[in-house]
Amino acid sequence: QPPPPPPDATCHQVRSFFQRLQPGLKWVPETPVPGSDLQVCLPKGPTCCSRKMEEKYQLTARLNMEQLLQSASMELKFLIIQNAAVFQEAFEIVVRHAKNYTNAMFKNNYPSLTPQAFEFVGEFFTDVSLYILGSDINVDDMVNELFDSLFPVIYTQLMNPGLPDSALDINECLRGARRDLKVFGNFPKLIMTQVSKSLQVTRIFLQALNLGIEVINTTDHLKFSKDCGRMLTRMWYCSYCQGLMMVKPCGGYCNVVMQGCMAGVVEIDKYWREYILSLEELVNGMYRIYDMENVLLGLFSTIHDSIQYVQKNAGKLTTTIGKLCAHSQQRQYRSAYYPEDLFIDKKVLKVAHVEHEETLSSRRRELIQKLKSFISFYSALPGYICSHSPVAENDTLCWNGQELVERYSQKAARNGMKNQFNLHELKMKGPEPVVSQIIDKLKHINQLLRTMSMPKGRVLDKNLDEEGFESGDCGDDEDECIGGSGDGMIKVKNQLRFLAELAYDLDVDDAPGNSQQATPKDNEISTFHNLGNVHSPLK
């Protein structure tokens, strides 16, 4: 071993360096001292450090560590925060477009149903937004409410427009009859299936992104233990006490220290990996009826079809309802009277065709690819931090926590540190409570993501079966579940091109019954020119 270089006889260099950390020189000895009171930088000879300096070094070391950790996660944090915001806004835009498409359909095809229809449509899409953002609403209740509200208006305005005002008290009877007589056929169930599946996946996707932010924020603001502070001080600052200002810590030594300091954080790694892979599975399954963009933008067509279905059955319905609601004042129960089967339109529903440019779908896949480059983020953190702080290359002529060495030996360093600090002990302490909490949250979201990603056994399918979902309605892989038939295919060109349009706000006013509605014109919904041409079956 080379003899240590002679210490600075006056501690001048140490004084000038320390002054940058702590203005004033009262804590720095003018000449080397025995340092018998030191607890971290245990001297092998005279030292230029005092106990107060050591404390300041420890505080600075912990702050340095926190800053290094924050800069290590900055890119990942920005990636998730930015995408969570972009997707939330994009989903809101999809909901607004879907609302405007639906209002436009009513205005063009059923002007007599407005403004009531606008009000009900507005309330329905408000519920959709609330659901996506995490509110505890039952999707079936939402859809039922839409059709419960629409039917009395459809009946009194379209099917039986001659009803006198005094007959409007039959609204309550009509509301009940809507379900009893299945006046919209299986369309409400179809919409329930589509909307519940697509929205549940959308909601969990947003929840997962927001949890990702929470994970990074938690590890970003970890307060490192005093034991870690001592190890960091020994690695970064104890060399100064010997006047070795230009010496860098050995790379191997840095890795050992960082692994000790970050033992708790690294425990997140397993669950973080699973989080990214589960999120990828979820995203891969977000198509057809699991893609809210596809489902919501096609809703206007399915609702249009459902009203056409009512109109086709108008004759039988009017007769049945005439009997059922003749004395609506006395009707205090759900009707047990069921008519013979109504006419059922067997026409196959066609798929809404999408010419993808930069849709939400492609943006989701792009996010996953970027996230996957951070899959080893937590396991790689110790190495990353060492590579972004001053360490000696090739572990030659470097500081091992006690002295300047020609070559770093992990075994020697461990033996030398035995009396000062036990690395193994630090690892055995387990993660901080906040880390344990975030691991629990990751486990929970991973379970949800896995459940949602099972292609045939999604939670929603089971729930729908319990609700009595009929086999003839719409299965997972049936394309016809996407959109209604209308007068042929709905061709949505450049479906959202949403990045370019994110700031483009369609709605003048989100209040129900808004008078400034989108107006389809010349077979195009002109309000949506920035989205490309939306060819709709609305006449």
Epitope: E123, L130, G134, I137, N138, D510
Partner: antibody, heavy 121, light 110 residues
Framework: QVQLQESGGGLVQPGRSLRLSCAAS????????MAWVRQAPGKGLEWVSE????????YYADSVKGRFTISRDNSKNTLYLQMNSLRAEDTAVYYC??????????????WGQGTLVTVSS | QSALTQPPSASGSPGQSVTISCTGT?????????VSWYQQYPGKAPKLLIY???NRPSGVPDRFSGSKSGTSASLAITGLQAEDGADYYC??????????FGGGTKVTVL
């Protein structure tokens, strides 16, 4: 005509239980969300609980969560509020209210006349 | 959940106008959520005046109008009449779908 009629109120000792009922008539009960709202003497309105039309979702004010349970029987057109571990501060007129919509709380367009619950030893 | 903020009282002479404000937060009034207004006479059940921020149920005079902007809503009563003397409550719901009422405003017709 549309009507809500509460019953079950009265004087009860702290810590005891009470069950309120609300009989609905004149509307299709099973398609609307329903709620309980209370008003302490000389005070403002305080929402207590809400239940969706199907009964699949229930919502509670923090002040009653864990003590009160809302439920409905759509076949009987009846709304219930089971109140356990009653406290003096639960003393109020309890109104049964019909929501305009079925999915969740929005606006209450029909109200009962209220039933007085007094919690006192 | 905390109550929406309303002024405790407001007054006006017959024929004049009165506006009652209702202030909430971004998670109730300021969100997607709608605001409703109720009128209550002493010893009586409340009556719905406005729903969905600005819609009037049938039977409510058009002297009553509602509006919402940001985290605030307001009820305007024009052409004040003696029978408008009552308590008025605003109501909304938060992101957890829990209903929240305002503290109430007593309107006095001078």
């Amino acid at each position: 005509q549309v009507q809500l009629q509460e019953s079950g109120g009265g004087l009860v000792q702290p810590g005891r239980s009470l069950r309120l009922s609300c009989a609905a008539s004149g509307f299709t009960f099973s398609t609307y969300a329903m709620a309980w709202v209370r008003q302490a003497p000389g005070k403002g309105l305080e929402w207590v609980s809400e239940i969706s039309s199907s009964g699949s979702r229930t919502y509670y004010a923090d002040s009653v969560k864990g003590r009160f349970t809302i439920s409905r029987d759509n076949s009987k057109n009846t709304l219930y509020l089971q109140m356990n571990s009653l406290r003096a501060e639960d003393t109020a007129v309890y109104y049964c209210a019909k929501d305009r919509r079925g999915s969740h709380a929005d606006a209450f367009d029909v109200w009962g006349q209220g039933t007085l619950v007094t919690v006192s030893s | 959940q905390s109550a929406l903020t309303q002024p405790p009282s407001a007054s006006g002479s017959p024929g004049q106008s009165v506006t009652i404000s209702c202030t909430g937060t971004s998670s109730d009034v300021g969100g997607y959520n709608y605001v409703s207004w109720y009128q209550q006479y002493p010893g009586k059940a409340p009556k719905l005046l406005i729903y969905g921020n600005s819609n009037r149920p049938s039977g409510v005079p058009d002297r009553f109008s509602g509006s919402k902007s940001g985290t605030s809503a307001s009820l305007a009563i024009t052409g004040l009449q003696a029978e408008d003397g009552a308590d008025y409550y605003c109501q909304s719901y938060d992101s957890s779908l829990r209903v929240v009422f305002g503290g109430g405003t007593k309107v006095t017709v001078l």
